[in-house]
Amino acid sequence: LIQERRSHQNNPAAHLTGANSSLTGSGGPLLWETQLGLAFLRGLDYHDGALVANKAGYYYIYSKVQLGGVGCPLGLASTITHGLYKRTPRYPEELELLVSQQSPCGRATSNSRVWWDSSFLGGVVHLEVGEEVVVRVLDERLVRLRDGTRSYFGAFMV
Amino acid sequence: LIQERRSHQNNPAAHLTGANSSLTGSGGPLLWETQLGLAFLRGLDYHDGALVANKAGYYYIYSKVQLGGVGCPLGLASTITHGLYKRTPRYPEELELLVSQQSPCGRATSNSRVWWDSSFLGGVVHLEVGEEVVVRVLDERLVRLRDGTRSYFGAFMV
Amino acid sequence: LIQERRSHQNNPAAHLTGANSSLTGSGGPLLWETQLGLAFLRGLDYHDGALVANKAGYYYIYSKVQLGGVGCPLGLASTITHGLYKRTPRYPEELELLVSQQSPCGRATSNSRVWWDSSFLGGVVHLEVGEEVVVRVLDERLVRLRDGTRSYFGAFMV
């Protein structure tokens, strides 16, 4: 029993939460809260928006983003792409892992109507030590942040 | 090998399913089937809609609700909120854990059109012994129950 | 530590990805890539679209499908059903495990408008040795495949 408990305590896991600073507008990935509130890191590291593996293996990675807007203003993409991407030193360009495309603006029948939508991604991927996973949303201007419960990013080893 | 197997058999996990009695209309959380069909409890308890932790640790908790309606009748919220909330003896009010907002009615272009939508939430949270997690949906009148496969609630220790 | 590591390496897990051959049009389940790209099988088998359990226990199973189209052509269902189903030798018919219904076409306000939507399912189910899980989508003509990152199917023992 002691052994079983210890194994759980050591199993890499993390849950990062959205904050006002998540949206940089710089074209980079979303940034995350790692310590306050519901956020934590256990056996994984964090660096500039990325969860970093300290132990090689298969991880269930997940992310949810809360989307919202008023109508569909011109200049905003009618398609929103939410994805989890891997960074690895050998391949400097990010590799797609899990991706969703949605057209939530279409729900609003007039330009003045408020709409909300949510996108959830989750799946098992392999990470080597030092490999990183980030979240991107295009167009990130439609991501609605509040208190860390509506947009988040996490992982655990399976 | 025996030890590995035992560790799996003892790992807290649960999957609860929606039933006709899930929607109380009382303003309380959704209630769930815990034993019949696909529902089970292993190392977690259930009490008045809540999954109750028997062992402290990090849990991946999840819920899906099936939403549906005919048009968007007046009096129904155009925004639906689906959330997982924690109850802990130290705080009298429920704490938001994972929340989604959606505007599914906007999909129906006329008041007579049938629409369906689904909301999925999942993420890792920490639970102490005796802490509870519940599911709430506002407006719960739009939750469509059938056979326990469309609306459900579960957790497992990671 | 050796034991904990071994237990992770042996823990059944799989992630299968969508490919052009996934959609058969035959009324059968979706088929999947099992080896290349992000796809892998560890302690689970694959057979004609199905993940097959080699070890009895509780599994978190999940699937995401990317949906998309242009308007809502006549003859296409306005409701899309995405589900995970169990095949077991004891019962000739597939058993529903986790199911979602969505009406994504309603998002397109004209017949020429492109729309995208995504459906995610995940939950814990019990599988005996030899039992199979498959993914079905009705109407599968609306499933959009690309690169294995947008539509996928996986599982791991919890």
Epitope: A56, E128 | - | A19, E33, T34, Q35, L41
Partner: antibody, heavy 117, light 110 residues
Framework: QVQLVQSGAEVKKPGASVKVSCKAS????????ISWVRQAPGQGLEWMGW????????NYAQKLQGRVTMTTDTSTSTAYMELRSLRSDDTAMYYC??????????WGQGTLVTVSS | QSALTQPASVSGSPGQSITISCTGT?????????VSWYQQHPGKAPKLMIY???KRPSGVSNRFSGSKSGNTASLTISGLQAEDEADYYC??????????FGGGTKLTVL
């Protein structure tokens, strides 16, 4: 860094078998497949098949089915390719390569197999 | 499934740009963004130059670029140099756990 080192050159008679090894280092061996590719003198690359190191699943090119067997030894992070009933047209450079997603990287240095009576 | 089609040879002078094509079908090249390119010098093992149609591994010169249009992928080498003289092979995912190689193209730097 990630590296694949293959066994040395072999000379075999027609009808014999050859077993080429490929030792991996610098990554988690059991998390990737190993593919085998051969190249006859002056010819292009020919994919022979691969093996998934974590579950030993194999996938062989149709023209080699029944003559080729790919195996792994996870304890030594080594992959093996055995080709039986050798013919003169099996004379080639045999390469192993890590199968990373949908490409081959890195490659072993190659093992020359000469089939001659 | 037959091999992808590449020209047997191409040539160019130092400083010029050349493009090598790789033609398949909608079931392989056209169906996925999973085309890779390999460079092979005489007597050496192949080396990955491009993956996922257009991405370069670390250490590969930015003179090498990849693209795709329909069922045809292309490798372009700009500012041609003497050391670029080699054989080049394309490879594409073709579904159902299958990868296909092209027949290879011999690049001569004049």
């Amino acid at each position: 860094q990630v590296q694949l080192v293959q066994s040395g050159a072999e000379v075999k008679k027609p009808g014999a078998s050859v077993k080429v090894s490929c030792k991996a280092s610098g990554y988690t061996f059991t998390s990737y497949g190993i593919s085998w590719v051969r190249q006859a003198p002056g010819q292009g690359l020919e994919w022979m098949g691969w093996i998934s190191a974590h579950n030993a699943n194999t996938n062989y090119a149709q023209k080699l089915q029944g003559r080729v067997t790919m195996t792994t030894d996870t304890s030594t992070s080594t992959a093996y390719m055995e080709l039986r009933s050798l013919r003169s047209d099996d004379t080639a450079m045999y390469y192993c390569a890590r199968l990373y997603r949908n490409w081959f990287d890195p490659w072993g240095q190659g093992t020359l197999v000469t089939v001659s009576s | 499934q037959s091999a992808l089609t590449q020209p047997a040879s191409v040539s160019g002078s130092p400083g010029q740009s050349i493009t090598i094509s790789c033609t398949g079908t909608s079931s392989d090249v056209g169906g996925y963004n999973y085309v890779s390119w390999y460079q092979q010098h005489p007597g050496k093992a192949p080396k990955l130059m491009i993956y996922d149609v257009s991405k370069r591994p670390s250490g590969v010169s930015n003179r090498f670029s990849g693209s795709k249009s329909g069922n045809t992928a292309s490798l372009t080498i700009s500012g041609l140099q003497a050391e670029d003289e080699a054989d080049y092979y394309c490879c594409s995912y073709a579904g159902s756990s299958t990868l296909l190689f092209g027949g290879g193209t011999k690049l001569t730097v004049l």
